[in-house]
């Protein structure tokens, strides 16, 4: 049994780190493999993660952790029974993928404005809470070429756009993702999309 592609891990900087790797051939990850992880510096537990299959030769493991701090460093050992397949380390603060924003809501009852709001995926005491910026993707359900990205570089999880910038009588969808500049993170996954109908009509004298 051989590792084809070594484990790579990302942390949500809260409670879960996700490690993925590929094996040299078809593997029943949960039956044959275990990923052990332990904090360096501390008198701490060696934890065991049972991986799941991720395609024929791929495995994925979700490592449960307490809130992450910048100096955390974990040793990682991938075992197949009594055989050590791979040994490595992982510093969560250097490989952060934020959680996806949630509760994306569209408010169209404000005249001439479409207001989008969503929730910051972190509690206020998390280091990422005040560091997230967002990208909002809005697209026309009937015309995928009619798609735009709005970068939200301020902290408040809201975006206002003039309804007049969208086509009237058309259904639109929006989704949002996040990243944290000071932690040099990757983008989060997109939030679930939400749909609304743009009923805005220009005033008669402007037609």
């Amino acid at each position: 049994m051989k590792v084809l592609q070594e484990p790579t891990c990302v942390s949500d900087y809260m409670s879960i780190s996700t490690c993925e790797w590929k094996m040299g051939g078809p593997t029943n990850c949960s039956a044959e493999l275990r990923l052990l992880y332990q904090l360096v510096f501390q008198s701490s537990e060696t934890h065991t993660c049972v991986p799941e299959n991720n395609g024929g030769v791929g495995c994925v493991c979700h490592l449960l952790m307490d809130d992450v701090v910048s100096m955390d460093n974990y040793t990682l050992d991938l075992w197949a029974g009594q055989q050590l397949l791979w040994k490595g380390s992982f510093k969560p603060s250097e490989h952060v993928k934020p959680r996806a924003p949630g509760n994306l809501t569209v408010h169209t009852n404000v005249s001439d404005t479409v207001l989008l709001t969503w929730s910051n995926p972190y509690p206020p005491d998390n280091y990422l809470y005040n560091d997230l910026t967002y990208a909002v993707n809005i697209w026309n359900e009937n015309d995928l070429a009619d798609s735009r990205i709005h970068n939200v570089t301020y902290l408040k999880p809201t975006l206002r756009i003039p309804a007049s910038t969208l086509k009237s009588g058309i259904s639109y969808r929006a989704r949002v993702r996040a990243w944290a500049q000071h932690y040099n993170t990757t983008w989060s996954e997109w939030s679930p999309s939400t749909k609304w109908y743009n009923s805005y009509r220009e005033p008669f004298e402007q037609r």
Epitope: Q42, S43, S44, E45, D66, V69, M71, D125
Partner: antibody, heavy 118, light 106 residues
Framework: EVTLKESGPVLVKPTETLTLTCTVS????????VHWIRQPPGKALEWLGV???????DYNAAFKSRLTISKDNSKSQVVLTMTNMDPVDTATYYC????????????WGQGTTVTVSS | DIQMTQSPSSLSASVGDRVTITCRAS??????LAWYQQKPGKAPKLLIY???TLAEGVPSRFSGSGSGTDFTLTISSLQPEDFATYYC????????FGQGTKLEIK
């Protein structure tokens, strides 16, 4: 509900061996480590050692030569054994549950007071 | 071993006061610090870990800050039930506690 309860002798003679039992409920010893901490009268807390969920142990170097921590998962019991007791070992002894990946203590027993005297 | 020094060793304050307790480590412990509250005849209770993360069920008037060697526990508005002894604990192996700060009613 998570609970831990220490039990054992109230009085121990110098040079004797102390055996304390921590009986837990509301969680499994196969999932959590359990620490022992003591507090001499009017003094600060002192970490003695831990037994992890997998059965491995870590000890405070100051007590390593005379301390053993073991457990019986099926009985939900952790046992502390400290040899060659001395009057300076008079203290309240606590067992406490380890919180996740951090060696901090989220649930504690109420403590048992042990006096070492002849 | 890393030594933890708390200050002050005792302090008197009134209900509603803002109180700060400090803990200094003899060497860098990063953010590996916890705070506990202990009332007479009772076991300690975890308040904060990772220097600033509030433990479950702890009121938001408690907050922690600091990293490296200098840390503080702040109680923004003292309540009658907050009068107790407070301990810091680092968890760079081996674990050690501070000597405690006794918070008394003025």
């Amino acid at each position: 509900e998570v609970t831990l309860k220490e039990s054992g002798p109230v009085l121990v003679k110098p040079t004797e061996t102390l055996t304390l039992t921590c009986t837990v409920s509301g969680f499994s010893l196969t999932n959590y480590g359990v620490h022992w901490i003591r507090q001499p009268p009017g003094k600060a807390l002192e970490w003695l050692g831990v037994i992890w969920s997998g059965g491995s142990t870590d000890y405070n170097a100051a007590f390593k030569s005379r301390l053993t921590i073991s457990k019986d998962n099926s009985k939900s019991q952790v046992v502390l054994t400290m040899t060659n007791m001395d009057p300076v070992d008079t203290a309240t002894y606590y067992c406490a549950r380890n919180k996740g990946t951090r060696p901090v203590f989220d649930y504690w027993g109420q403590g048992t007071t042990v006096t070492v005297s002849s | 071993d890393i030594q933890m020094t708390q200050s002050p060793s005792s302090l008197s304050a009134s209900v509603g006061d803002r109180v700060t307790i400090t803990c200094r480590a003899s060497e860098n412990i990063y953010s590996y610090l916890a705070w506990y509250q202990q009332k007479p005849g009772k076991a300690p209770k975890l308040l904060i870990y990772n220097a600033k993360t509030l433990a479950e069920g702890v009121p938001s008037r408690f907050s922690g800050s600091g990293s490296g060697t200098d840390f503080t526990l702040t109680i923004s508005s003292l309540q009658p039930e907050d009068f107790a002894t407070y301990y810091c604990q680092h968890y760079v192996s081996p674990l050690t506690f501070g000597q405690g700060t006794k918070l008394e009613i003025k």
